[in-house]
């Protein structure tokens, strides 16, 4: 009964109910069933230790080494703030693709890098909370092996552009404050557009699995296609946005746009281009420096701001950018003031004009003469791309273009009164801006990119991947800690602890068959011996 | 606030090597390249070579190619130029200078005070 | 490699006057490659302007600089006591290289 009910948990007691019938019809004699029972209870006992001990061998074996953690930290100065992120994975699996996950992000509080030029002795202060946060949620113990990396994205790219020797004092003081802390820290730099492009690209495929080569017997990522095809990844900034696919046929027109990898054992041919100047926040400055050179007075009716909206804007805030320069001219005033009429199609046009399509040396271009091969493939679109989407309510993969830019004119033909209302938590600032920040996003998508109504199902708006912010740091960090190998790193084909399982499962089968063969095929004389 | 302060004066004799120090303080010394220019007594500046001292790379004026060589101790953000095979027209005042971050121009915004290095037999 | 020329070799001018210094390049440079350096007697050099017309942090706007292509200017709006020194330029495109200098000295 115990052997019984021992082997039907393990699935097997059909089996052994069969076994055990032939020798229950041997019954010749009492003396013969007796001594076949207690062969039987004999192997039986024999055959439970045998599993037990496999059992005990090898789940002791198999029993969880203490994981080796390690945390690495990226801070991403942008343009507009700086937020911080701390990733974490085990030790012993590095190379291993999918194992780097976030555990925190810290928003730091205040406008970006950039903006502390005038008064570069608080940013030490500016990034305590956040540090001190990072001190709390790394162990103490990891504390001085944890690298620290920042990296400074466009509104220090225009810095450095107006004065270098200012972008280079920012990066002094934060690099000052940033190695009081017992982290590791690896220095604070200014990364280009092409980095930015190539490490947002990397950190959406690895969080995707695009680089493993494995197969998986299930997915547990979303956006679910040809796991081989990398998606492309669409990132805007507040200064500037990044395009990153592999383009259907390796193109050598513009090798300025070129980047070769090899990752994981396969080679990639990466399309990539920055757009200074084409975040959202410089873009709206764009537009309103180049709207106002043709207004008549100090007042801008601006179709990208809902109706009854109002705001008075500096003139030399408008002309502080090197983005606007471009549009800069001697006005009769020194501010004046946006006041809004809510027309998303007047909007459009106007966003349009930023975009000079009328020259391309190349046989296609983005704009601006930029070269953009053909689209290939399913897109990631993050960073302020899924914000603004997110927040309009469009993220969704069943919402059309059409249905979108129907969505557009009618949000931004709500008077500004009624938006307050509506959304009364946000700050208005922000939810000024929403209107031609979602307008913007659909020229720069549609007009500036060339997506159609029908590719635009290709496009999928992603804040977080497996509980990862989508966006350049992860890459960058995998790039730096030297976490994404050029080889598929040698591994067995089943980790080691499957290994173990499987074979304590062979070797209680293997048993209990020749229990099985014993009894069958193979019985004593000593069983038929006096049956004469 | 920055500084660099480099090693004192020597007086070699032609065909020996000079080490010439330079010590970085006031920021975070792998940030930034580090220059060496020399001055000959009355004359011009000249431009050696530089050393990024975030991996160790170096980058030396074709005119000293093989008889110059930069170093650097991150241990103690110092950087080291050695020129070998001396002669009486390597006396000059060497000056370390620091350059770029990544990605910047190269001007030279801060100098060390010098260093006479003087060749005589 | 680039060679600079700078003119004149000497500049005898009084306190108050303008200083016009020039910096001709024997090839085209990129106005972002381009600087001049103000030396002391005995002193190590200081950069004025950086991208052929951006003042260095902390230098007085007297200092101005100027041109593109290959013909460099640096000005000094009017002469204190203290600009009278030694004036170098300087490019950068693969190795830097200096030009011969301008000495600005009391008339």
């Known amino acids: 009964m115990l052997f019984d009910s021992i082997l039907s948990t393990v699935g097997l007691s059909k089996l052994v109910s069969v076994v055990s019938s032939p020798a229950a019809a041997l019954s010749k004699s009492n003396v013969k069933t007796f001594c076949s029972k207690n062969i039987l209870a004999i192997l039986g006992f024999s055959s439970i230790i045998a599993v037990i001990a496999l059992l005990a061998v090898g789940l002791t074996q198999n029993k969880a080494l203490p994981e080796n953690i390690k945390y690495g930290i990226v801070l991403d100065a942008g343009s507009s703030h700086t937020s911080l992120y701390i990733y974490k994975w085990p030790a012993e699996k590095e190379n291993d693709t999918g194992v780097v996950h976030q555990v925190e992000e810290c928003r730091v509080k205040g406008p970006g890098i950039s903006k502390y030029v005038q008064k570069v002795n608080e940013i030490g202060i500016y990034l305590t909370d956040c540090m001190e946060r990072a001190r709390e949620v790394i162990p103490r113990s990891q504390h001085q092996e944890t690298p620290v990396y920042l990296g400074a994205t466009a509104g220090m790219r225009l810095l450095r552009m107006e004065s270098e020797e200012l972008a280079d004092r920012v990066l002094d003081v934060v690099e000052r404050s940033l190695s009081n802390y017992p982290f590791d820290f690896q220095g604070a730099r200014i990364i280009t557009g092409q980095e930015e492009g190539a490490y947002g690209w990397i950190t959406i495929n690895y969080l995707l699995g695009k680089f493993s080569q494995k197969t998986r017997w299930f997915s547990i990522v979303p956006y679910e296609t040809n796991n081989q095809e990398t998606f492309g990844a669409l990132d805007l900034g507040g200064a500037s946005t990044q395009i990153t696919f592999v383009p259907q046929n390796q193109t050598t027109e513009s090798p300025d746009n070129a980047l070769q990898f090899r990752l994981y054992g396969k080679d990639y041919n990466v399309y990539t281009h920055s757009f200074l100047c084409y975040g959202k926040d410089q873009a709206l400055w764009q537009k309103l420096a180049k709207d106002i050179q043709v207004a008549s007075n100090e007042i801008l009716r601006d179709p990208c701001f809902h109706p009854g909206y109002k705001k008075v804007v500096n003139v030399s805030d408008l002309y502080k950018t090197p983005c606007t320069k471009r549009f800069e001219m001697t006005l009769p005033f020194q501010q004046f003031e946006i006041q809004g009429i809510g027309n998303y199609q007047q909007c459009h046009q106007s966003v349009l004009e930023l975009f000079n399509t009328s020259y391309c040396p190349y046989s296609q271009c983005a704009f601006n003469g930029i070269f953009l091969p053909p689209l290939q493939g399913d897109f990631g679109a993050f960073s302020a791309f899924y914000f603004v989407m997110n927040f309009l309510n469009l993220t969704s993969e069943k919402v059309s273009q059409e249905k979108v830019t129907e969505m557009m004119k009618k949000f931004c033909s709500q008077p500004w009164e009624e938006i307050k209302t509506s959304y009364a938590g946000v700050k208005e600032k922000y939810l000024s801006e929403y209107c031609f920040s979602g307008t913007y996003i659909l020229s720069l998508l549609l007009q500036g990119y060339h997506f159609t109504a029908d590719s635009w199902e290709h496009i999928h708006f992603i804040g977080k991947i497996q509980g990862s912010d989508a966006g350049w740091t992860l890459g960058y960090m995998l790039n730096l800690t030297n976490m994404i190998p050029a080889e598929q790193p040698l591994s067995t084909p089943l980790s080691h602890s499957t290994y173990v399982f499987l074979m304590v499962l062979f070797s209680l089968v293997l048993v209990i068959v020749a229990i099985i063969g014993l009894l069958i095929f193979h019985k004593p004389s000593y069983f038929w011996k006096d049956m004469v | 606030q920055v500084q660099l302060v480099q090693s004192g004066a020597e007086v070699k004799k032609p065909g020996a090597s000079v080490k010439v120090s330079c010590k970085a303080s006031g920021y975070i010394f792998k940030s930034y390249e580090m220059h060496w220019v020399r001055q000959a007594p009355g004359q011009g500046l000249e431009w050696m070579g530089r050393?990024?001292?975030?991996?160790?790379?170096?980058w030396y004026a074709q005119k000293f190619q093989g008889r110059v060589t930069m170093t650097r101790d991150t241990s103690t953000s110092t950087v080291y130029m050695e020129l070998s095979s001396l002669r009486s027209e390597d006396t000059a005042v060497y000056y370390c200078a620091r350059g770029k971050r990544e990605g910047g121009t190269e001007y030279l915004r801060v100098w060390g005070q010098g260093t006479l290095v003087t060749v005589s037999s | 490699e680039i060679v600079l020329t700078q003119s004149p070799g000497t500049l005898s001018l009084s306190p108050g006057e303008r200083a016009t210094l020039s910096c001709r390049a024997s090839q085209s440079v990129s106005s972002s490659y381009l600087a001049w350096y103000q030396q002391k007697p005995g002193q190590a050099p200081r950069l004025l302007i950086y991208?052929?017309?951006s003042r260095a942090y902390g230098i007085p706007d007297r200092f101005s600089g100027s041109g593109s292509g290959t013909d460099f200017t640096l000005t000094i709006s009017r002469l204190e006591p203290e600009d009278f020194a030694v004036y170098y330029c300087?490019?950068?495109?693969?190795?830097?290289?200096f030009g011969g200098g301008t000495k600005v000295e009391i008339k």
């Open positions: 050393i990024n001292p975030s991996v160790g790379s170096t």
């Open positions: 991208y052929a017309s």
């Open positions: 300087q490019q950068y495109h693969n190795a830097i290289t």
